[in-house]
C-alpha cells in the first residue's frame, strides 16, 4: 500500500486523522464492518480534545464508537488500552443493563445526546463515526 497523506472526499481531517460521520443508523457490528470496508475503524477516543471534536460533529444524537465488551473486558477496536486510556462515561455507566427486554446485557458503547458515553444493546441502529489515521501504510478508503 501507499501512505495516505490526505483525507478522502467527504471525510474530515483533524489532528492527523480522518473522520467520517454517518447520517443514518446501523447495528454496531454492521457499522464496524462499514468502517473496515473503508480501511478505517469505528472512532477511538483518546483525549478530551478528540471527544469535543467528535461531539461537535455528531450533535445530540446516539452514535456508536469503537468500544465494546462483547468478549468480556472493554476493548477499543484498534487495540488502544482501555484501562489507561481516556474515558467519558455517564454517571452509573457502563451498567450492562438487562432490563431492556431484548435479551442479554449491553456490550457496545455510544455517545449519548450530551456526548458522554453509555453502554447499550449492540443491535440498536445508531449512527456511527469512522476514523482512519493519516500517514499509515494503506490505500485510501473508497471515495464517496
Amino acid at each position: 500500500g501507499s501512505e495516505r497523506t490526505c483525507c478522502p472526499v467527504n471525510w474530515v481531517e483533524h489532528e492527523r486523522s480522518c473522520y467520517w460521520f454517518s447520517r443514518s443508523g446501523k447495528a454496531w457490528a454492521d457499522a464496524d464492518n462499514y468502517c473496515r470496508l473503508e480501511d478505517a475503524h469505528l472512532v477511538v477516543v483518546t483525549s478530551w480534545e478528540e471527544q469535543k471534536f467528535v461531539q461537535h460533529h455528531i450533535g445530540p444524537v446516539n452514535t456508536w464508537m469503537g468500544l465494546h465488551d462483547q468478549n468480556g473486558p472493554w476493548k477499543w477496536v484498534d487495540g488502544t488500552d482501555y484501562e489507561t486510556g481516556f474515558k467519558n462515561w455517564r454517571p452509573e455507566q457502563p451498567d450492562d443493563w438487562y432490563g431492556h427486554g431484548l435479551g442479554g446485557g449491553e456490550d457496545c458503547a455510544h455517545f449519548t445526546d450530551d456526548g458522554r458515553w453509555n453502554d447499550d444493546v449492540c443491535q440498536r441502529p445508531y449512527r456511527w463515526v469512522c476514523e482512519t489515521e493519516l500517514d499509515k501504510a494503506s490505500q485510501e478508503p473508497p471515495l464517496l
Epitope: 500500500g1 462499514y34 473496515r36 470496508l37 473503508e38 490505500q139 478508503p141
Partner: antibody, heavy 121, light 108 residues
Framework: EVQLLESGGGLVQPGGSLRLSCAAS????????MNWVRQAPGKGLEWVSA????????FYADSVKGRFTISRDNSKNTLYLQMNGLRAEDTAVYYC??????????????WGQGTLVTVSS | DIQMTQSQSSLSASVGDRVTITCRAS??????LNWYQQKPGKAPKLLIY???SLQSGVPSRFSGSGSGTDFTLTISSLQPEDFATYYC??????????FGPGTKVDIK
C-alpha cells in the same frame, strides 16, 4: 471505459481448487472495496466475499468461510478469489463487483460479465 | 441474517404499462435497499440505491420507495428493453448484502 473482466472459471472436480481473477480498468481500483457475487444456474444472486480497498480487511459468507480466500493486487488492478475444497453447490457464474458508498448507503455499481465455475465429477 | 422476499416470482405486462415490484425485509433495514436489473446471460445492473436514489445513467421511468421492511420499485411506462428480472438487495448488514429471489417481468 469503466470495466471489470473476470477469468479463471472452468470445470473442476469436487474437492478441487480454482483461482478466479478480475481485472479492473477505467477507475481508481484501490479506492474501492470489491466483492464476489455468485449465481447458480437458474437461481438468484448470492454475496460471497468482500475486501476493502487497501486489502487489509476481508469478509466471507458462511457458506464459503475457510474454503475461499479473497485478495487483491492494487499494483495490477486485479481482484482474486482462491477457491479450495470445491463442492457441487459452488457451481455458479461468479461476478466481481465494486462497492459504492454514498452517504452511508452501499451498493454494487460496477459488475463484470461473470465467469462460470462448474464443479462435477 | 436478514431475509429478503419478493412476493411475485414473475409478472406479465405490456409496453407502456405502469409496473410495480415489491420487496420485503425480515426486519427493519431503514432505507438500506437497492434494486438491480438483470437480463439473460448478462450481469446485474444497479438501478436504485438507498431505497429511492436513481443510479447515474438509469432512465427516470424507474423509481424506488419505501423504508423499514416494505419497498417498491416502479417502472412508470414499461419499455421493450425493461423485460428482465429485478432483484432487491439489503445493504444494512454490511457486508452480507442479501438479495431477494427476483421478479421476472415478461411480455403479456
Amino acid at each position: 471505459e469503466v470495466q471489470l473482466l473476470e477469468s479463471g472459471g472452468g470445470l473442476v472436480q469436487p474437492g478441487g481448487s480454482l483461482r478466479l481473477s478480475c481485472a479492473a480498468s477505467g477507475f481508481t481500483f484501490s479506492n474501492y472495496a470489491m466483492n464476489w457475487v455468485r449465481q447458480a444456474p437458474g437461481k438468484g444472486l448470492e454475496w460471497v466475499s468482500a475486501i476493502s480497498g487497501g486489502g487489509g480487511n476481508t469478509f466471507y459468507a458462511d457458506s464459503v468461510k475457510g474454503r475461499f480466500t479473497i485478495s487483491r493486487d492494487n499494483s495490477k488492478n486485479t481482484l482474486y478469489l482462491q477457491m479450495n475444497g470445491l463442492r457441487a453447490e459452488d457451481t455458479a457464474v461468479y461476478y466481481c463487483a465494486s462497492r459504492i458508498a454514498v452517504a452511508g448507503s452501499e451498493a454494487f455499481a460496477i459488475w463484470g460479465q461473470g465467469t462460470l465455475v462448474t464443479v462435477s465429477s | 441474517d436478514i431475509q429478503m422476499t419478493q412476493s411475485q416470482s414473475s409478472l406479465s405486462a405490456s409496453v407502456g404499462d405502469r409496473v410495480t415490484i415489491t420487496c420485503r425485509a425480515s426486519q427493519s433495514i431503514a432505507s438500506y435497499l437497492n434494486w438491480y436489473q438483470q437480463k439473460p446471460g448478462k450481469a446485474p445492473k444497479l438501478l436504485i440505491y438507498g431505497a429511492s436514489s436513481l443510479q447515474s445513467g438509469v432512465p427516470s421511468r424507474f423509481s424506488g420507495s419505501g423504508s423499514g421492511t416494505d419497498f417498491t420499485l416502479t417502472i412508470s411506462s414499461l419499455q421493450p428493453e425493461d423485460f428482465a428480472t429485478y432483484y432487491c438487495q439489503q445493504s444494512y448488514s454490511t457486508p452480507l448484502f442479501s438479495f431477494g429471489p427476483g421478479t421476472k417481468v415478461d411480455i403479456k
